[in-house]
């Protein structure tokens, strides 16, 4: 819920601090899933939905983009997942549950989701650090 | 016992550049963030810029142009280099620890004064 | 940039005696009922030593006497009572938002 205070209730130079160590692992995420899974797609079916509708400058969503990371976790590189989800811990609200999120069973449908899910982030982090670089909070 | 320890030449030419080291002991610099701020003659602190736990670098836009500031993990190690110094740049440089638990700098080095004259 | 502006820039008080230094900021650095303005001292030839962070907390090994009050863009930090090793300059330091920035620093004398 809005109202709700963050876990650690970070200041804008601490989520900046956050939003520069997400940015090289997520551009890296995905340009070596695009190398290793030539000719798929984008999927028009899934979107994550991470930035926070309820706050100017936007944040980032991040109880909205944590399940989708735990989700393709075990299909992707663990390794930098594991680094992406430690980052999203810092700035997840406290008590908002996390859905659960299910890849898709067909390999091609699911490498597809995955896809979409780093490109999307990647522009949420794009959009984010925008934000915090135009001026005042 | 967290030390910071800086050292560099004392006095830099005009144009030039300025390089220091931050040899830190007691901690890590792969955890936490790892700081340079300088202090000018008439006692104005100014805040430099960062590198993280990760090797990400952020600087402040006043300076972005001229400072790079890199680490050497196997010496645990940080350095700031400044280029194109000026008169304006005469100053004493400390290394500093971001401490998580304050967001403040816990520790800092004693400070390394540094004259760009000709 | 938030500005960070101090009072008074020097200060003189008797032995014994309190000290209060006033630092404001330009804009709130405030998030969530939390402050992040921090208190330092140096003293001469020394590096400066974090006294009092997020506005309220004492630093570990500092001293009881020291302590600091404030939210939003008001602080204060107070010295009582103030003893003959307090001569030093104080600044106020946000770290709030980017780039971080410093109060010009007031300097406590003994009268």
């Known amino acids: 819920s809005s109202h709700m205070a963050p876990t650690h209730q970070l200041p804008p130079s601490d989520v900046r601090k956050i939003i520069l160590e997400l940015q090289p692992l997520s551009r890296g995420l995905l340009e070596d899933y695009q190398k290793k899974e030539t000719g798929v797609p984008e999927s028009n079916r899934t979107l994550l939905l991470c930035l926070t509708s309820d706050s100017q400058p936007p944040r980032l969503n991040s109880s909205a983009i944590l399940p989708y990371f735990r989700a393709i976790r075990p299909l992707s590189d663990k390794n930098i997942i594991d680094k992406i989800i430690e980052q999203l811990d810092k700035l997840k609200f406290q008590h908002e549950p996390e859905t659960e999120i299910s890849v898709p069973a067909d390999t091609f449908e699911c490498k597809s989701f995955i896809l979409t899910i780093l490109q999307q982030f990647s522009a949420c982090l794009e959009s984010v650090f925008k934000s915090l670089n135009s001026g005042p909070q | 016992e967290v030390q910071l320890v800086e050292s560099g030449p004392s006095l830099v030419k005009p144009g030039g550049s300025l390089r220091l080291t931050c040899s830190v002991t007691?901690?890590?610099?792969?955890?936490?963030?790892w700081k340079w701020i300088r202090k000018f003659p008439g006692n104005k602190l100014e805040y430099m810029g960062y590198?993280?736990?990760?090797?990400?670098?952020d600087y402040n836009p006043s300076l972005k142009s001229r400072i790079t500031i890199s680490r050497d993990t196997s010496k645990n190690q940080y350095y700031l280099q400044l280029n194109s110094v000026t008169t304006e740049d005469t100053a004493t440089y400390y290394c500093?620890?971001?401490?998580?638990?304050?967001?403040?700098?816990?520790?800092w080095g004693q400070g390394t004064s540094v004259t760009v004259s000709s | 940039d938030i500005v960070m502006t101090q009072s008074p820039a020097s200060l003189s008080v008797s032995l014994g005696q309190r000290a209060t230094i006033s630092c404001r900021a330009s804009?709130?650095?405030?998030?969530?009922?939390?402050?992040?303005m921090h208190w330092y001292q140096q003293k001469p030839g020394q590096s400066p030593k974090l006294l009092i962070y997020?506005?309220?907390n004492l630093e570990s090994g500092i001293p009881a006497r020291f302590g600091g009050s404030g939210s939003g863009t008001d602080f204060t930090l107070t010295i009582d009572p103030v003893q003959a090793d307090d001569v030093a300059t104080y600044y106020c330091h946000q770290s709030y938002e980017d780039p971080w920035t410093f109060g010009g620093g007031t300097k406590l004398e003994i009268k």
């Open positions: 997020r506005a309220s």
């Open positions: 500093a620890r971001y401490a998580n638990y304050g967001y403040a700098m816990d520790y």
């Open positions: 804009e709130s650095v405030d998030t969530y009922g939390r402050s992040f």
């Open positions: 590198i993280s736990y990760s090797g990400i670098t």
């Open positions: 007691g901690d890590s610099i792969t955890s936490g963030y």
